[in-house]
């Protein structure tokens, strides 16, 4: 359903936001060497790309309404 889809997207966005902050905090405590700067840039870009990837891939996964029903129809009550 749309609610489930929105919930899943929200979860992923929240997860990525938390992961980005954690990675940035860890890197900011590292000495500002050229390597550290490059690493921080890579992580920032990487999570930004992951966010973009999720927003596109979300449309490719089958939505929940088009997956397997909980009960096979042959065991359901006749209409």
């Amino acid at each position: 359903s749309e609610a489930e889809d929105a919930s899943l997207l929200s979860f992923m966005q929240g997860y990525m936001k938390h992961a980005t902050k954690t990675a940035k905090d860890a890197l900011s405590s590292v000495q500002e060497s050229q390597v550290a700067q490059q690493a921080r840039g890579w992580v920032t870009d990487g999570f930004s790309s992951l966010k973009d990837y999720w927003s596109t891939v979300k449309d490719k996964f089958s939505e929940f309404w088009d997956l397997d029903p909980e009960v096979r129809p042959t065991s359901a009550v006749a209409a």
């Epitope: 996964f61 089958s62 929940f64 309404w65 088009d66 129809p73 042959t74 006749a78």
Partner: antibody, heavy 114, light 112 residues
């Protein structure tokens, strides 16, 4: 017992239209998402379209988007596929299928040729 | 689109022997809900396809236990132990994890 019976197929010229129907019985039709799947002459199976239980959600393969419309009437236990601007490559046997591929109709032949 | 590659394209088996069909997916078939929507279907001559296995390894009711589905991620297998004459037909794997939903090209099982 459960039955899915397709109808509405036939021979049509390119650019023409057809409306396929699938009469469902033997189960609570309104509680199951449905699909149309076709089998082209070389025997390959292709998913065509899906529709949610209330008809609010629909999905189509790219090659039929804008030409085909899936719909359902839960009061009549019937699934539909309106096919417009038909092309020779739409020639196939069209099957009505319950989501998850658990049950299939016998199929209806659609031939698009001049 | 997720390509499903089945091998072999055809096989001929003596009744009583085992048969194995492979299905390789171009992408990991695990859905965000944690389930893997990989199916095995059989189409007997002149009939509509029928589902044998759903979600990789679950046999449909009425399907003999000689049919076994296994695998994960991108590699899946259908094994038929002690093949019977009535098992002849074309076997398809199918995925429902992604749109568009796709099918393998089929494996024709012939009984010698």
């Amino acid at each position: 017992q459960l039955q899915l019976v397709e109808s509405g197929g036939g021979l049509v010229q390119p650019g023409g239209s057809l409306r396929l129907s699938c009469a469902a019985s033997g189960f609570t039709f309104g509680t199951y998402s449905m699909r149309w799947v076709r089998q082209v002459p070389r025997k390959a199976l292709e998913w065509v379209s899906s529709i949610s239980t209330d008809g609010g959600g629909t999905a189509y393969r790219d090659s039929v988007k804008g030409r085909f419309t899936i719909s359902r009437d839960n009061a009549k236990n019937t699934l539909y596929l309106q096919m417009n601007n038909l092309k020779p490559e739409d020639t196939a046997i069209y099957y009505c299928v319950i989501a998850g591929y658990s049950d299939w109709g016998q199929g209806t032949q659609v031939t698009v040729s001049s | 689109d997720v390509v499903l590659t089945q091998t072999p394209g055809s096989l001929s088996v003596v009744p009583g022997e085992s048969a194995s069909i492979s299905c390789k997916a171009g992408q990991n078939l695990v859905h965000p809900d944690g389930k893997t929507y990989l199916y095995w279907l059989l189409q007997k001559p002149g009939q509509s396809p029928q589902r044998l296995i759903y979600q990789v390894s679950n046999r449909d009711s009425g399907v003999p236990d000689r049919f076994t589905g296994s695998g994960s991620g991108t590699d899946f297998t259908l094994k038929i132990s002690g093949v019977k004459v009535e098992d002849a037909g074309v076997y398809y794997c199918a995925q429902g994890t992604y749109w568009p939903k796709t099918f393998g090209q089929g494996t024709k099982l012939e009984i010698k």
